[in-house]
């Protein structure tokens, strides 16, 4: 069961896996959650009754029964991992710890104006896990305003000590705040040299890449496929690093694949969720249980529901045996990966889906796109909402996109003349406007947050957030879309769609069924040529066909320009303005969402 509260002055006895140092019990719980085996933990807070060398220790624990005996101990704080919980989990930690020195390898020292600047520096440095900043009150003159960037093998401090007039904190890479580029490509027939920091077994290069992404020291990886000539290295995933943060060489080798950690854009990719099945593949590991199951899907469910299960192998039933049920082997290992992978034995293997909640909901695969046609089908664009005003009469006002369970992203210009959020209603999971009746459930709007630099759509900053009065329960027909990563600024999106209930031509009416149109992006230079009277800034993005014919129009405003990249949909633009609708050589102009990621996160993550 899920236990979220912390147990004060309580220590769990036994079951120790490893000890790490964390600045708080809350962060110890996060570390436990992300550790492949940890189910419980005991944290020691600073206390006069405790030996200072034990302050800030976070002991990660495991137990076959999922619990351990409790012992009273002053300054001890214990609790359970969030693995047992169904709610969304994030590794993002924005807390700043005053008068704490988090020890690690100090690999970079520079002057910074503030702790915030130091944290930003850490977030934008590929090696940095955490930092310590000496404030201007620090006793030693030559160390004042010094920002120390640090890393360790585990990503957590090697020790934490009390030190007056310093502050410490963690990199915000896991908060989607890094400007580091993400190289999402996997390079075939390529081996990276440089230093191996770890190695695990993986069924394919994609799983290897995800393991690299959540490994604190991994910056890039090489994976040897099952056709690799050296048998002992088949399915081996080498996790790598280098001083520069990039591979120093490219080595061409058949049957090997290489790629990069996606730590800077992990909010918009699945990292923990290995949802594929691997046929004719057996995963070896410590056996947890063997149960009968009707199918490999049923076996995966059993693994997902068993909190200690990390992966499984299903052996289908022999002809008429055991009521057609096969054997489901539930397994685990010290690092969450199989200890060996074998092929040709007829098993079907896969991983627990329990960890999927550690990924952003927006990375979940949605049903395949319907090719052709202009009318959408239900569940095709589950982030699209219709924003209604009830004054003077109820009508569709604008589109919008679900980006969080209490947040809609839309255009600022939609709220011209809107005096109060009370007159607004947000409908999600809607395909046809005609579905909306008196008794149709909706979300009330608690707050309208318009960008404070917004004046008019044509001059930019045409972006607004709606904070909903209640939270959205995600389903197949209503779920969030990922924000683009700042590290993806160089990505060329080729599969972009604009959606909405807006006009189909300039003089028309709101459409009943949600419309869709695939539209190519246009460079800002090209767009500027088409709008000589306007300034097309880098905070805008344009899309449209040279010959016209497909475009957003009145009523689509605030809705998404959604682009699919690496199987994940990203909210690349917000429908903003344009000259007419679908006119020749007049592309639509959209708010360039990637340029507002900081603003969105600042507003949505404000305490």
């Amino acid at each position: 069961e899920c236990v979220t509260q912390l147990l004060k002055d309580t220590c769990f006895e036994g079951g120790d896996i490893t000890t790490v140092f964390t600045p708080s019990a809350k962060y110890c719980q996060v570390v436990c959650t992300y550790h492949p085996r940890c189910l419980l933990f005991t944290f020691t807070a600073e206390s006069p009754s405790e030996d200072p060398t034990r302050w800030f220790t976070c002991v990660l624990k495991d137990s076959v029964t999922e619990t351990l005996p409790r012992v009273n101990r002053t300054a001890a704080i214990s609790g359970y991992s969030f693995k047992q919980c169904s709610h969304q989990i994030s590794a993002c930690n924005k807390d700043i710890y005053v008068d704490l020195d988090m020890k690690g390898i100090n690999y970079n020292s520079s002057v910074a104006k503030s702790a915030q600047e130091c944290q930003e520096r850490c977030t934008d440095d590929v090696h940095c896990h955490f930092f310590t900043y000496a404030t201007r009150q620090f006793p030693s003159l030559e160390h004042r305003n010094i920002c120390l960037l640090k890393h360790t093998q585990t990503g957590t401090p090697t020790r934490i000590t009390k030190l007056d007039k310093v502050v410490s904190g963690f990199s915000l890479k896991s908060c989607a705040l890094s400007n580091l580029a993400c190289i999402r490509d996997i390079f075939p027939n390529t081996v990276f040299a440089d230093s191996n920091i770890d190695s695990v077994m993986a069924p394919d290069a994609f799983v290897c890449g995800r393991i690299c992404t959540h490994h604190p020291g991994c910056l890039f990886f090489t994976f040897f496929s099952q056709e690799w000539p050296k048998e002992s290295q088949r399915n081996l995933c080498l996790l790598k690093t280098s001083e520069s943060g990039l591979p120093s060489t490219r080595i061409k080798k058949s049957k090997a694949l290489s790629g990069f950690s996606l730590q800077s854009c992990r909010h918009s990719i699945p990292v923990f969720c290995h949802s594929s099945f691997y046929h004719d593949t057996d995963f070896l590991g410590e056996e947890l249980d063997i149960v009968a199951a009707k199918s490999h899907e049923a076996c995966q469910k059993l693994c997902t529901n068993a909190v200690r299960c990390q992966f499984f192998t299903y052996t289908p039933a022999q002809a008429s045996c055991n009521e057609g049920k096969g054997k489901c082997y539930l397994k685990l290992s010290s690092n969450g990966s199989p200890t060996k992978i074998l092929h040709g034995r007829g098993g079907i293997s896969g991983y627990t889906l329990r960890l999927c909640k550690m990924d952003n909901e927006c990375t979940t695969k949605i049903k395949p796109r319907i090719v052709g046609g202009t009318a959408s089908v239900r569940g095709e664009w589950p982030w699209q909402v219709t924003l209604h005003t009830t004054s003077p009469t109820q009508r569709h006002l604008c589109g919008g996109s679900i980006i969080g369970n209490q947040w809609i992203l839309t255009a600022a210009h939609c709220f011209y003349g809107v005096e109060s959020p009370k007159i607004l209603r947000v409908y999600s999971g809607i395909l046809n406007q005609s579905e909306i009746k008196e008794d149709t459930s909706f979300f009330g709007v608690q707050e309208i947050i318009i960008h404070d630099q917004y004046k008019m759509a044509e001059s930019g900053y045409d972006i607004a957030l709606l904070k909903l009065e209640t939270t959205v329960n995600y389903t197949d027909s209503q779920r969030p879309i990922c924000l683009p990563s700042k590290g993806d600024r160089n990505v060329i999106y080729t599969d972009c769609w604009v959606t909405g209930w807006g006009y189909r031509k300039l003089r028309d009416k709101i459409q009943n069924t949600l419309q869709k149109a695939k539209i190519p992006l246009v460079t800002n230079e090209e767009c500027q040529k088409r709008y000589r009277g306007h300034k097309i800034t880098h905070k805008m993005i344009c899309a449209g066909y040279r010959e016209g014919g497909k475009d957003a129009c009145k009523g689509d405003s605030g809705g998404p320009l959604s682009c699919k990249h690496n199987e994940v949909w990203h909210l690349v633009g917000i429908t903003s303005w344009g000259e007419g609708c679908a006119q020749r050589e007049r592309p639509g102009v959209y708010t360039n969402v990637v340029e507002y990621v900081d603003w969105i996160l600042e507003k949505t993550q404000a305490v």
Epitope: P188, N189, L246, R250, K252
Partner: antibody, heavy 120, light 107 residues
Framework: EVQLLESGGGLVQPGGSLRLSCAAS????????MTWVRQAPGKGLEWVSS????????LYADSVKGRFTISRDNSKNTLYLQMNSLRAEDTAVYYC?????????????WGQGTMVTVSS | DIQMTQSPSSLSASVGDRVTITCQAS??????LNWYQQKPGKAPKLLIY???NLETGVPSRFSGSGSGTDFTFTISSLQPEDIATYYC?????????FGGGTKMEIK
């Protein structure tokens, strides 16, 4: 027609700087590794630097590391080579080339080259 | 770094002759070797990639073979338009390196 066109070469003094450009057309520039190769007068070919399609990963020959910077602008279909602290031994025709193949490393399209002369 | 040794450095042959150039790598490069032709004042042109694969549009009189450390490039029947310098290039790892070149002349 698939084409690469270099520009920006010229005469420069030792210690000086120069920026070469290479305009690409006729293919999807943003999906290829791009490379600079140089050829000193009467000499053979020397690999200088390569850059991945999205620009996030660059590689350099030891002879230019720390002095030259390769970059690209995919929206302009253009490859660049910023050359600083130039030396007499950098005098050469500089070619930009497109890499092809499953893992790159073979150059199937070349520009016509631009001459860089470093001399006082 | 992988050194590439090409021989001969120059070669004189008659039209119609079968001509062979060799290239030796300082370490095993599997079949990761490419051959280029460069005519005076022009950019190089890819002829053969991965030791033996003929690039599209290249006449079939050009061929390549070898693997490991020893490679051969052959023109089965030399034509006047084949007057050029030929280079081998290893594509096994960066830094990518070229052979010193073989200058082809007609007798």
């Amino acid at each position: 027609e698939v084409q690469l066109l270099e520009s920006g070469g010229g005469l420069v003094q030792p210690g000086g700087s120069l920026r070469l450009s290479c305009a690409a057309s006729g293919f999807t520039f943003s999906t290829y590794w791009m490379t600079w190769v140089r050829q000193a007068p009467g000499k053979g070919l020397e690999w200088v630097s390569s850059i991945w399609s999205s620009g996030g990963w660059t590689l350099y020959a030891d002879s230019v590391k720390g002095r030259f910077t390769i970059s690209r602008d995919n929206s302009k279909n253009t490859l660049y080579l910023q050359m600083n602290s130039l030396r007499a031994e950098d005098t050469a025709v500089y070619y930009c080339a497109r890499e092809v193949g499953a893992a790159g490393f073979a150059f199937d399209i070349w520009g016509q080259g631009t001459m860089v002369t470093v001399s006082s | 770094d992988i050194q590439m040794t090409q021989s001969p450095s120059s070669l004189s042959a008659s039209v119609g002759d079968r001509v062979t150039i060799t290239c030796q790598a300082s370490q095993d490069i599997s079949n990761y070797l490419n051959w280029y032709q460069q005519k005076p004042g022009k950019a190089p042109k890819l002829l053969i990639y991965d030791a033996s694969n003929l690039e599209t549009g290249v006449p079939s009189r050009f061929s390549g073979s070898g693997s490991g450390t020893d490679f051969t490039f052959t023109i089965s029947s030399l034509q006047p338009e084949d007057i050029a310098t030929y280079y081998c290039q290893q594509s096994s790892s960066t830094p990518l390196t070229f052979g010193g070149g073989t200058k082809m002349e007609i007798k």
